[in-house]
């Protein structure tokens, strides 16, 4: 026969059991709340720091590009590519047609102030895109020049000059004194490149990398 516990002992045991249960409950709640806090704070901090980074990046560009047009890249809502608002975009670059007439050097300096260069054309597709925005009765400076007059053409961004990816009009380049390249329209050959004097004012095309935020 098991001897019955004294009421005092029973109460003591119950109290001890309850204490253990409540302790476990409190610890569990604490653990859960820690887990919840961690799970919500980490992404929040991540998003916050990404936003801060974006804002500082935008501030960088704001001095010469007060307004950007951005599009979502792929399916990820966090990746955006932007071009300054009046610029057009193609692949990974932004383009701006400058209608002011200036010398080649001044045109390049103007592009540079906007964080860009005179346009470097790398493919036929790129040229086909660019010409959609050009006027047939105008000429536009490219970022291509031969300052030494020795037919050592060079792109402003140091991209190697590849004779196989050039779109000179037939018979061009044809003059050692004409050390800067333009793109213009000739009824016989459509759009192509021509060498002209660098100091003669022309319109121009600026190109910059897209801004990723």
């Amino acid at each position: 026969m098991v001897p019955e516990e004294e009421p005092q002992d029973r109460e003591k045991g119950l109290w001890w059991f309850q204490l253990k249960v409540w302790s476990m409950a409190v610890v569990s709640i604490l653990l859960l709340s820690v887990c919840f806090t961690v799970s919500s704070v980490v992404p929040h901090n991540f998003m916050y720091s990404k936003t801060v980074k974006r804002l500082s990046k935008l501030r960088e560009y704001q001095q010469y590009h007060p307004s950007l047009t951005c599009v979502m890249e792929g399916k990820d809502i966090e990746d955006w590519s932007c071009c300054p608002t009046p610029w057009t975009s193609f692949q990974s670059s932004c383009y701006f047609i400058s209608t002011g007439m200036q010398s080649w050097t001044k045109s390049q300096k103007n592009c540079s102030v906007m964080g860009a260069d005179l346009v470097v054309i790398n493919t036929r597709e790129e040229q086909d895109f660019i010409i959609q925005n050009l006027k047939r009765n105008s000429s536009y400076f490219l970022g291509l020049s031969d300052p030494g007059g020795r037919r050592h053409w060079q792109w402003v961004d140091q991209t190697p000059y590849n004779e196989n990816v050039t779109f000179w009009h037939s018979g061009e380049p044809n003059n050692l004194d004409e050390r800067c390249a333009i793109i213009n329209f000739r009824s016989s050959e459509e759009w192509g490149w021509n060498d002209i004097h660098c100091h003669v004012p022309q319109k121009s095309i600026c190109k910059m990398k897209k801004i990723y935020i």
Epitope: Q102, S103, W104, T105, K106, Q108, K109, S145, P147, G148, G149, N174, N175, L176, D177, E178, R179, C180, I196, H197, C198, H199, V200, P201
Partner: antibody, heavy 121, light 111 residues
Framework: EVQLVESGGGLVKPGGSLRLSCAAS????????MSWVRQAPGKGLEWVAT????????YYPDSVKGRFTISRDNAKNSLYLQMNSLRAEDTAVYYC??????????????WGQGTTVTVSS | DIVLTQSPASLAVSPGQRATITCRAS??????????MHWYQQKPGQPPKLLIY???NLESGVPARFSGSGSETDFTLTINPVEAEDTANYYC?????????FGGGTKVEIK
């Protein structure tokens, strides 16, 4: 030896015309851009017109645009300046100058002796 | 148009002394280390003669007492030592863009 010899200057009435010539020798004329630069009595130098070596481009300041025409005859090694609707302020010594390109610009490395144009009634 | 301002308008120098003429452009005439500013000498009754091209290059046949320096908007022609035959008007000219423009000239007289 490079030589540039201007001719054709003289006295002309306002509204009249004159054609200046510049005979070049001692260099391959067809390979160089050429310019006309003028100097009014007691004044500084003022560029008037430029023609590229291949005859593809001509440039003028606003002060003469539409009135003056620069041309060249590479077969004759000659440069010309046709001046129409002449005004008193066109009175000057007119120099023919050869352009030598350097990097993105150029300078005038040889000058003729000049020919005097006087516009007066 | 790029305006070139020369100073002084005139100066008188003793033989053997140094003459310094400055030319200030209304905007930069330099690009990637090339300075498209040139200097000419014009003696009375004669056409201009090229002295210095691209800011500091001495034209062949020009005496070494002539030198040029400067970049961007500020350029200097120095004659050292000055000789009697250097009495003339001196002009700067830019060619980085059309129209090519000349400074107003500096008249150098030898005392």
């Amino acid at each position: 030896e490079v030589q540039l010899v201007e001719s054709g200057g003289g006295l002309v009435k306002p509204g009249g015309s004159l054609r200046l010539s510049c005979a070049a020798s001692g260099f391959t004329f067809s390979s160089y851009g050429m310019s006309w630069v003028r100097q009014a009595p007691g004044k500084g130098l003022e560029w008037v017109a430029t023609i590229s070596s291949g005859d593809s481009y001509t440039y003028y300041p606003d002060s003469v645009k539409g009135r003056f025409t620069i041309s060249r005859d590479n077969a004759k090694n000659s440069l010309y300046l046709q001046m129409n609707s002449l005004r008193a302020e066109d009175t000057a010594v007119y120099y023919c100058a050869r352009q030598l390109y350097y990097s993105y610009g150029y300078y005038f490395d040889y000058w003729g002796q000049g020919t005097t144009v006087t516009v007066s009634s | 148009d790029i305006v070139l301002t020369q100073s002084p308008a005139s100066l008188a120098v003793s033989p053997g002394q140094r003459a310094t003429i400055t030319c200030r452009a209304s905007e930069s005439v330099s690009f990637h280390g090339t300075h498209l500013m040139h200097w000419y000498q014009q003696k009375p009754g004669q056409p201009p003669k090229l002295l210095i091209y691209a800011a500091s290059n001495l034209e062949s046949g020009v005496p070494a007492r002539f030198s040029g320096s400067g970049s961007e908007t500020d350029f200097t022609l120095t004659i050292n030592p000055v000789e009697a035959e250097d009495t003339a008007n001196y002009y700067c000219q830019q060619s980085i863009e059309d129209p090519p423009t000349f400074g107003g000239g500096t008249k150098v007289e030898i005392k």
